[in-house]
Amino acid sequence: ELCDDDPPEIPHATFKAMAYKEGTMLNCECKRGFRRIKSGSLYMLCTGNSSHSSWDNQCQCTSSATRNTTKQVTPQPEEQKERKTTEMQSPMQPVDQASLPGHCREPPPWENEATERIYHFVVGQMVYYQCVQGYRALHRGPAESVCKMTHGKTRWTQPQLICTGEMETSQFPGEEKPQASPEGRPESETSC
């Protein structure tokens, strides 16, 4: 089930998914001067079963000026560039992603893709927050948010993170020592 809202915005912080739940959709967006090929996919879709998940469809961009050229490649890891993972985020380096059952990894870039990635998350998706460069994290609890559904409405839990203006950065999970476990997260479910 699609999350019909966005993860919370935390001042001076960005968020990222470590892996994407099955059902997640990624818009096939092209950079300026390029467009999706005529019969090309609108989205990539994370599909699969409990043992293996992968992205269905391939995004393909072609020059807006050219009718018959298509560009679509799977680059080597060293070719991967910094990306945005939703339309409101700032670029962050890809991180190593554990193979979670029922989840897809970050899809590799396609040639001439837009600078921002627009993901459509599903219920159960978790995203992790980090403070932007120049800000330090003060944790009251886990710096994460989960999309939940209550009474047919979707909402994201509030991450327990404050970013203060000190010259130090906190990293995503896997890039520093582990933080508090998710079990301690306050739920604060909204009433119907």
């Epitope: 089930e1 699609l2 019909d4 809202d5 966005d6 059902g23 959709m25 609108l42 989205y43 879709l45 339309e87 409101m88 459509h120 599903v122 219920v123 559904m149 047919g152 409405k153 979707t154 909402r155």
Partner: antibody, heavy 116, light 106 residues
Framework: QVQLVQSGAEVKKPGSSVKVSCKAS????????MHWVRQAPGQGLEWMGY????????EYNQKFKDKATITADESTNTAYMELSSLRSEDTAVYYC?????????WGQGTLVTVSS | DIQMTQSPSTLSASVGDRVTITCSAS?????MHWYQQKPGKAPKLLIY???DLASGVPARFSGSGSGTEFTLTISSLQPDDFATYYC?????????FGQGTKVEVK
């Protein structure tokens, strides 16, 4: 209480445009996406797209990508849908519906009739 | 796109009848949602997340199913229930609805 009040019925000539409004009240307008749904006479419901009023981001059903433009005005808590290059097959009732999951609140609908 | 196929398209029934409407999705979905619409009115949320009744909906309505096959049941049809019913998926874009099932007086 939550209310979505849409603009009145419109009769338009082929080739012209129309802008339908949907004024929201009773909740925080920017906290929910606003979706638009079309119903042609005697037909079923078709999802057209949505807008995130807080940032103006839109997502469209590809079928309506070149037909509809969805906008929002935070200052008046109003969402708009403009239909361009109208043809007789655009004759329908257009509904706005509050998102955030299932469509729990709907506007009363706006009938747009395209006729020469 | 996920196609939603409702059956039957029209259902003739009498007050007190048990009525069943089915909705088949062309791909597996997480949940089905159901709306009721009366002539000249906007659709009204009836059942969400497959089996949960929306606020104010009588207990004679129920929903069930999983994967691609879902059902809406009215245990004992009442005069107020003559309307058109739509199934709806929001598991993937574009969001889609079934073509509708009109429940009419026999």
């Amino acid at each position: 209480q939550v209310q979505l009040v849409q603009s009145g019925a419109e009769v338009k000539k082929p080739g012209s445009s129309v802008k339908v409004s949907c004024k929201a009240s009773g909740y925080t307008f920017t906290s929910y996406r606003m979706h638009w749904v079309r119903q042609a006479p005697g037909q079923g419901l078709e999802w057209m797209g949505y807008i995130k009023p807080s940032r103006g981001y839109t997502e469209y059903n590809q079928k309506f990508k070149d037909k509809a433009t969805i906008t929002a005005d935070e200052s008046t808590n109003t969402a708009y849908m403009e239909l361009s290059s109208l043809r007789s097959e655009d004759t329908a009732v257009y509904y706005c519906a509050r998102g955030g999951g299932v469509f729990d609140y709907w506007g009363q609908g706006t009938l747009v009739t395209v006729s020469s | 796109d996920i196609q939603m196929t409702q059956s039957p398209s029209t259902l003739s029934a009498s007050v007190g009848d048990r009525v069943t409407i089915t909705c088949s999705a062309s791909s597996k979905i997480s949940y089905m949602h159901w709306y009721q619409q009366k002539p000249g009115k906007a659709p009204k949320l009836l059942i969400y997340t497959t089996s949960d009744l929306a606020s104010g909906v009588p207990a004679r309505f129920s929903g069930s199913g999983s994967g691609t096959e879902f059902t809406l049941t009215i245990s004992s049809l009442q005069p107020d229930d003559f309307a058109t019913y739509y199934c709806h998926q929001r598991s993937t874009y574009p969001l889609t609805f079934g073509q509708g099932t009109k429940v009419e007086v026999k």
